[in-house]
Amino acid sequence: TPLGPKWPEPVFGRLASPGFPGEYANDQERRWTLTAPPGYRLRLYFTHFDLELSHLCEYDFVKLSSGAKVLATLCGQESTDTERAPGKDTFYSLGSSLDITFRSDYSNEKPFTGFEAFYAAEDIDECQVAPGEAPTCDHHCHNHLGGFYCSCRAGYVLHRNKRTCSALCSGQVFTQRSGELSSPEYPRPYPKLSSCTYSISLEEGFSVILDFVESFDVETHPETLCPYDFLKIQTDREEHGPFCGKTLPHRIETKSNTVTITFVTDESGDHTGWKIHYTSTAQPCPYPMAPPNGHVSPVQAKYILKDSFSIFCETGYELLQGHLPLKSFTAVCQKDGSWDRPMPACSIVDCGPPDDLPSGRVEYITGPGVTTYKAVIQYSCEETFYTMKVNDGKYVCEADGFWTSSKGEKSLPVCEPVCGLSARTTGGRIYGGQKAKPGDFPWQVLILGGTTAAGALLYDNWVLTAAHAVYEQKHDASALDIRMGTLKRLSPHYTQAWSEAVFIHEGYTHDAGFDNDIALIKLNNKVVINSNITPICLPRKEAESFMRTDDIGTASGWGLTQRGFLARNLMYVDIPIVDHQKCTAAYEKPPYPRGSVTANMLCAGLESGGKDSCRGDSGGALVFLDSETERWFVGGIVSWGSMNCGEAGQYGVYTKVINYIPWIENIISDF
């Protein structure tokens, strides 16, 4: 019996009946065995077929078989109801071998020419399966020459049988307080040969509750308990299950914060699996009762472990723990069923006693000592000598705990000293140097340092003076002895002030003329304003109208008198302003250098002499009455003059203050 070619030889060829293309003889039997490589099959087709036809091909036939299975028994030329001729059919082996048997009986009624067939090995496509047959692979099948292989979708791994896809369904840990978990692919059939482990792990104090929902379908057996596929639930206390079948298991209250769910499947079956909805509970905390004037948020039926609430106070109330304020309050429920913080109080906001107002006072409007939310107080300044700056003085205790003005300011109002008040009623003409009376020149300041000089009080902590008067002390401000509130130069009864800093105009050059002869002294403390100590006003923009030629100004000081000594009592003199050209001309002849009188100076005095300021008066104010405001203002600062005070044809020269208003304002605002 010819075997035919065997792999690894090339597997293809031709078969024919004996004597082909002539007629075949009687009593012939011929067998061919074709073998292809593993993973290949054999394909066979006939190019010629002419055999004796007999019932069920009992006489002459060609039989094709593969293993134990007969693929076809062929005879005749064309197929009939009961006999089959190959025609144009192609035949395929079931495996890698094909047996072909040819037989003729003892007689032929007429000559038959037999058959001719061709064969070849071809790759088997193992991935193609007949309808109703189980697929070759669980998920993906990949054919190749001589074989195939299977692969799996993401989340699965190929079983060692190389065909089944087992689910990668272990190691999932659920830490939320509630959630859902289900068999892989639910509600589609779950995978075979899988072992799934799910963990629910909540914080200590929680207890997990399991509810099976929707449907439950796990392969079962009528007699044995879950022998194929099963679901088990394990806690640190007990094991539940195994579960299988089609009935939803009952709720499981685990009384544990950790649960392990195991699901094991075998290699067969087609079941949809299961779905679990889990929740958790814990020992509830006492229901939070909001403090008076407060409310709890969020409002819940109960509060368990990790639940929290916050307290919010009504407007005008604040969170307090005892005396200590809180911006916010949140309490968290602990595992033992207690809150982690005690309930605070919502106390009415108390702005506290209002701060004292320097040179002023405060009055409780709502009621004596009432300082709580919406209480009203009224600040006012000491009458006559102080006035309130840009504020009506009314403050309300607001919800933020601060006293707040109607303009929304939280800072105190400011009591500014009233400037330019004097007890003196001015005469219209010059009567000569006179003794000052109490309250006539309350801005007058006596400056004792290396020499005697003067100055004028501005506000309640600045002194305006001449640069030349304090130049030597500019780096040692504390050396200046500043006295005010007295008429007698040598009196022990005065108000003492000390200098914190001296500011000399940057345009002043010592011993080189008197241009920019102006300085400010900052006092280290505010002085108390009264009838004997009152600041002088700075000139308004319109002040020039009260300082024209022949307008009267008043100079005061303890400088040299006609007798040649410093005055014991404060003296003053009313003197007219001198035309600027006239004054400039008076100081252009020797011994004065040209340009001694500048635009930053003004002159005052009598052409006939006799009325003048003198040494010791330096730095003092030449003041004028503003008839519109009825306040005195400083127009000049005693600066320089002729060697002989009060000399005819010579005049006192004063620093023109109106030229320095920006400089003064900048220094005061900066320091």
């Epitope: 005396h323 200590l324 304020p325 911006k327 506290g352 705990g401």
Partner: antibody, heavy 114, light 107 residues
Framework: QVQLQESGPGLVKPSETLSLTCTVS?????????WNWIRQPPGKKLEWMGY???????SYNPSLKSRITISRDTSKNQFSLKLSSVTAADTAVYYC???????WGQGTLVTVSS | EIVMTQSPATLSVSPGERATLSCKAS??????VAWYQQKPGQSPRALIY???YRYSGIPARFSGSGSGTEFTLTISSLQSEDFAVYFC?????????FGGGTKVEIK
């Protein structure tokens, strides 16, 4: 984590003003709570001096009210103590702390002496 | 002001034993009381607030109780690191005040 650190001169002359600063890290002083100054004279008990709250409001021990000022610099996350007209009785270790004492500075000894 | 009186001034206890420290307020302070531990050269360490609430990180052997005017700090089993001075503190009203301290020493 929250840390408080006091700083300032260790020696102050009588009648002068004692100034200390507490620098807070790990928490904003405007977020919440009261921020205290507490002192402990040698061998004596702790004395609360006052606080400044998250909103900037202050509360002082009445025994010190005329001399004490507590202020803050929110840009630097600091709060400060000023105690004027000091005497030898103000010699102490000065601490800053948060609220009812969950966090404290390490303390700084201030001696009042000429 | 509210005076906080601690007793005893000194408490001698053997390691492993229980220590009970008392603090009395001169007026009702609710539960607005804190307890501190202080060791030489160190700043106070907060143990308890609101009379009975233990700060996180504080061992469970420390517990506080009381309300109104009488308060107690209990150390259930003294460890070597617990020997120190303990202060009570009321923060109920201005001025906030402290007790004079109880020194817990090794017997």
């Amino acid at each position: 984590q929250v840390q408080l650190q006091e700083s300032g001169p260790g020696l102050v002359k009588p009648s002068e003003t004692l100034s200390l600063t507490c620098t807070v890290s790990g928490y904003s002083i405007t977020s919440d709570y009261a921020w205290n100054w507490i002192r402990q004279p040698p061998g004596k008990k702790l004395e609360w001096m006052g606080y400044i709250s998250y909103s900037g409001r202050t509360s002082y021990n009445p025994s010190l009210k005329s001399r004490i000022t507590i202020s803050r610099d929110t840009s630097k996350n600091q709060f400060s103590l000023k105690l004027s007209s000091v005497t030898a009785a103000d010699t102490a270790v000065y601490y800053c702390s948060r609220h009812y004492g969950d966090y404290w500075g390490q303390g700084t000894l201030v001696t009042v002496s000429s | 002001e509210i005076v906080m009186t601690q007793s005893p001034a000194t408490l001698s206890v053997s390691p492993g034993e229980r220590a009970t420290l008392s603090c009395k307020a001169s007026q009702n302070v609710g539960t607005n009381v804190a307890w501190y531990q202080q060791k030489p050269g160190q700043s106070p360490r907060a143990l308890i607030y609101s009379a009975s609430y233990r700060y996180s990180g504080i061992p469970a052997r420390f517990s506080g109780s009381g309300s109104g005017t009488e308060f107690t700090l209990t150390i259930s089993s003294l460890q070597s690191e617990d020997f120190a001075v303990y202060f009570c503190h009321q923060y109920n009203s201005n001025p906030l005040t402290f007790g004079g301290g109880t020194k817990v020493e090794i017997k």
